[in-house]
Interface confidence: low
């Protein structure tokens, strides 16, 4: 199972509170919107999704220098004040997961189970991998439930 | 703005098959789930079950002998069916989309249809 | 499947009162757990995920906590338009199930 550790490590969080759209890893706990007040300052507009601030507001009502987050390792998903993009999330071939959508500036990676691998949580934090059966199948795996095996000395159909 | 636009039969026979179709205008078809839910006349809400753009379902297991929900890409639409209606299946048919994905808990039907009422009389 | 069950099942409250509406898993659904709000002849809104995150413009009026069974929803000061009909929702594991909901009237 991922620890909070591994999860974090893979997240900046810039964050989110009352902002657009919806975000997190699982172990990721909402906190107050970072960066929005510098030293008494406030910038004037935050940077839009795929961006962030190159440098810190200096005057009362400046407008950020915004830059581009690094394509495939970084991202922010939403309009926000902070000099840091979130770090694209791994999926952690380990713990059963592969790509399903691959990370861009504006949204992070989706992971999903790898073939023959299934999660009977809908928030998973990995996935399992299909049971083998040694006397035949009653159902098949997917991606939400194991597979049904035949016990021993039970007639085929 | 995502707009969910719901249509299909509203009055069948018991043994007839309840055929729903939900549209979904704007906004991103393929990151999200696409749910059907019901709501009997006077109760609450019942869970029917869900589909994404690659065709992954899930549905619940008391509907799960009688129910198909399927996806056409091509024109964003979901469709519902469900076979063999009795009464107990009269109520207002809603769809609604639902971010979820493996490792993250953000969740909630944040966009509904306007619900298709369907009545189940002989 | 996981029951969830909601109490009370209707509430009488004031303009300006604090409300408290609970929801209990019959099994532990760490913190996976949305709230709704349903008013007569509309689709439910959604309110609440991840047990106490607030979607995108839902006032801060509401807020909701608990994790494993048991879960609250708070309206902090209830204004008019907060009478109508809430449910709770676990996404933990298939199927997703709801609360039989609690019908909030003015008192």
């Known amino acids: 199972r991922l620890s909070s550790k591994s999860v974090n490590a893979q997240v900046t969080d810039i964050n989110s509170k009352g902002l657009e759209l919806r975000k997190t890893v699982t172990t990721v706990e909402t906190q107050n919107l970072e960066g929005l007040h510098h030293d008494g300052q406030f910038c004037h507009k935050p940077c839009p999704p795929g961006e962030r601030k190159a440098r810190d507001c200096t005057v009362n009502g400046d407008e950020p220098d915004c830059v581009p987050c690094q394509e495939g390792k970084e991202y922010t998903d939403k309009a926000h004040f902070s000099s840091k993009c979130r770090r694209c999330r791994l999926c952690d071939e380990g713990h059963g997961l592969e790509v399903e959508i691959n990370c861009t500036r504006t949204q992070n990676t989706k992971c999903r189970c790898k073939p023959n691998f299934f999660c009977n949580s809908t928030v998973c934090e990995h996935c399992d991998p299909c049971t083998k059966c040694e006397h035949g199948i009653i159902k098949e795996c997917t991606l939400t439930s194991n597979t049904k095996c035949k016990e021993e000395g039970s007639r085929s159909n | 703005q995502v707009q969910l636009q719901q249509w299909g039969a509203g009055l069948l026979k018991p043994s007839e098959t309840l055929s729903l179709i939900c549209a979904v205008y704007?906004?991103?078809?393929?990151?999200?789930?696409w749910t059907w839910i019901r709501q009997p006349p006077g109760k609450g809400l019942e869970w029917i079950g869900e589909?994404?753009?690659?065709?992954?379902?899930n549905y619940s297991p008391s509907l799960k002998s009688r129910v198909t929900i399927s996806v056409d890409t091509s024109k964003n639409h979901i469709s519902l069916n469900l076979t063999s209606v009795t009464a107990a299946d009269t109520a207002l048919y809603y769809c609604?989309?639902?971010?979820?994905?493996?490792?993250?808990?953000?969740?909630?039907?944040?966009?509904w249809g306007q619900g298709t009422t369907v009545t189940v009389s002989s | 499947d996981i029951q969830m069950t909601q109490s009370p099942s209707s509430l009488s409250a004031s303009v300006g009162d604090r409300v408290t509406i609970t929801c209990r898993a019959s099994?532990?659904?760490?913190?996976?757990l949305a709230w709704y709000q349903q008013k007569p002849e509309k689709a439910p809104k959604s309110l609440i995920y991840?047990?106490?995150s607030l979607q995108s413009g839902v006032p801060s009026r509401f807020s909701g906590s608990g994790s494993g069974t048991d879960f609250t929803l708070t309206i902090s000061s209830l204004q008019p338009e907060d009478f109508a009909t809430y449910y709770c929702?676990?996404?933990?594991?298939?199927?997703?199930?709801f609360g039989q909901g609690t019908k909030l009237e003015i008192k």
């Open positions: 609604a989309r639902g971010l979820l994905w493996i490792g993250e808990g953000d969740y909630g039907l944040d966009v």
């Open positions: 704007g906004g991103s078809f393929s990151t999200y789930y």
């Open positions: 589909i994404n753009h690659r065709g992954t379902t």
């Open positions: 099994q532990g659904i760490r913190r996976w």
């Open positions: 991840a047990a106490s």
């Open positions: 929702q676990q996404y933990n594991s298939y199927p997703y199930t």
